[in-house]
Amino acid sequence: QNSKLQEELQALRETFSNLTASTDAKVKTLSMQGGNVGRKMKSLESQLEKQQQDLSEDHSSLLLHVKQFVSDLRSLSCQMAVLQGNGSERTCCPVNWVGYEGSCYWFSRSGKPWPEAEKYCQLENAHLVVVGSWEEQKFIQHHVGPVNSWIGLTDQSGPWKWVDGTDYESGFKNWRPEQPDDWYGHGLGGGEDCAHFTEDGGWNDDICQRPYRWVCETQRDRDSGS
């Protein structure tokens, strides 16, 4: 009787031991799976966040593209109307140019020395901007913002001259107080020979090699191409 009880006890011990081992293994497996699920969730969360961010960026980008597309479409429609017309004066500007009164303007985003800026404008069948009135001054100022920007006014050949031949003496001027000083101390062989808009819109003369932004201007006529 006693030995039978001992056998049963031994059997129970083995069963319990097996059960404990099996439970331990299951707990380990479950905690591993839990860890994996946690990691997977974190990964999915960050993926979702990234996708949301990408989607938001794509949306902003798409809006910009649509705006640009609408603007380009308007410009192209206008230019088509000109081409289909009878050669009368056109009223539109090339793509990425801004129209005001009888001119089209292009505002640079980078900086170049004055001679390179003028060369750039010439390659676009234009010239550095010639400011003819207070209204035009305000229009340009609004577009360039508080950044030095070259204009088409220079005294490199002696007297101050506008690049398109507009008479300087009788024309509009917006020099800052005590400018132009044509300061000769810079050792370049000449003075400060090129004019630019300053942060507040007033004009200053400066060394032509300074890397300022610039503004190109072309007339809104049938010869100015696009």
Epitope: R109, G185, R213
Partner: antibody, heavy 120, light 107 residues
């Protein structure tokens, strides 16, 4: 107070890439141009790159042109320098520095620098 | 590129001395010149801009002059904290360029 803190330096093998960052605080970051300047061990200062206040204009020294890219995130007040195809001669302390204006004026504030070592 | 020649490359001076460092550029740069001070293991510190304008917080013992191609930095009365390396830099146009530096040491 006005502060610039560089990070991202380290040891890298020739031909590999590294990205430096510069965290700006204490001023309106989006209204100032920013520069990277480097200094090789025991040598003088060498200008590396500039980016204008609004990110529109970037200029580089000939020695890094085509390999380095300067960028900025005005919403995060952060300036970056992505350096690719690194060479032994790029080993230096890299400083970020603030332009006094939008990007074409003198430098007035400097970070403490981060060290880049290019070695096999 | 505009070359910058700084001289002397090093000098020994005593406390109280008047020290002058010169910087010459390969072409005229107007007044678009800055001066920096650098101590060992530290970042450069801006001293002057536009050739002669003092940065905020910089003592008036530092002064700058010149225009065109020839510039000078003067320390009117050298103090122990002024022993450092000084650099000139042009920012008239890109690429910005630095002089080779002048190390001011204690005599």
């Amino acid at each position: 107070q006005v502060q610039l803190v560089e990070s991202g330096g380290g040891v890298v093998q020739p031909g590999r890439s590294l990205k430096l960052s510069c965290a700006a605080s204490g001023f309106t970051f989006s209204t100032y141009g920013m520069h990277w300047v480097r200094q090789a061990p025991g040598k003088g200062l060498e200008w590396v790159a500039v980016i204008w206040y609004d990110g529109t204009n970037k200029n580089y020294a000939d020695s890094v042109k085509g390999r380095f890219t300067i960028s900025r995130d005005n919403s995060k007040n952060t300036l970056c320098l992505q350096m690719n195809s690194l060479r032994a001669e790029d080993t230096a302390v890299y400083y970020c520095a603030r332009d006094q204006g939008v990007g074409y004026d003198g430098l007035d504030v400097w970070g403490q620098g981060t060290t880049v070592t290019v070695s096999s | 590129d505009i070359q910058m020649a700084q001289s002397p490359s090093s000098l020994s001076a005593s406390v109280g001395d008047r020290v002058t460092i010169t910087c010459r550029t390969s072409q005229g740069i107007g007044k678009y010149l800055a001066w920096f001070q650098q101590k060992p293991g530290k970042a450069p510190k801006s001293l002057l801009y536009k050739a002669s304008s003092l940065q905020g917080g910089v003592p008036s013992k530092f002064s700058g002059s010149g225009s065109g191609t020839d510039f000078t930095l003067t320390i009117s009365s050298l103090q122990p904290e002024d022993f450092a390396t000084y650099y000139c830099q042009q920012y008239m146009t890109y690429p910005l360029t630095f002089g080779g530096g002048t190390k001011v040491e204690i005599k």
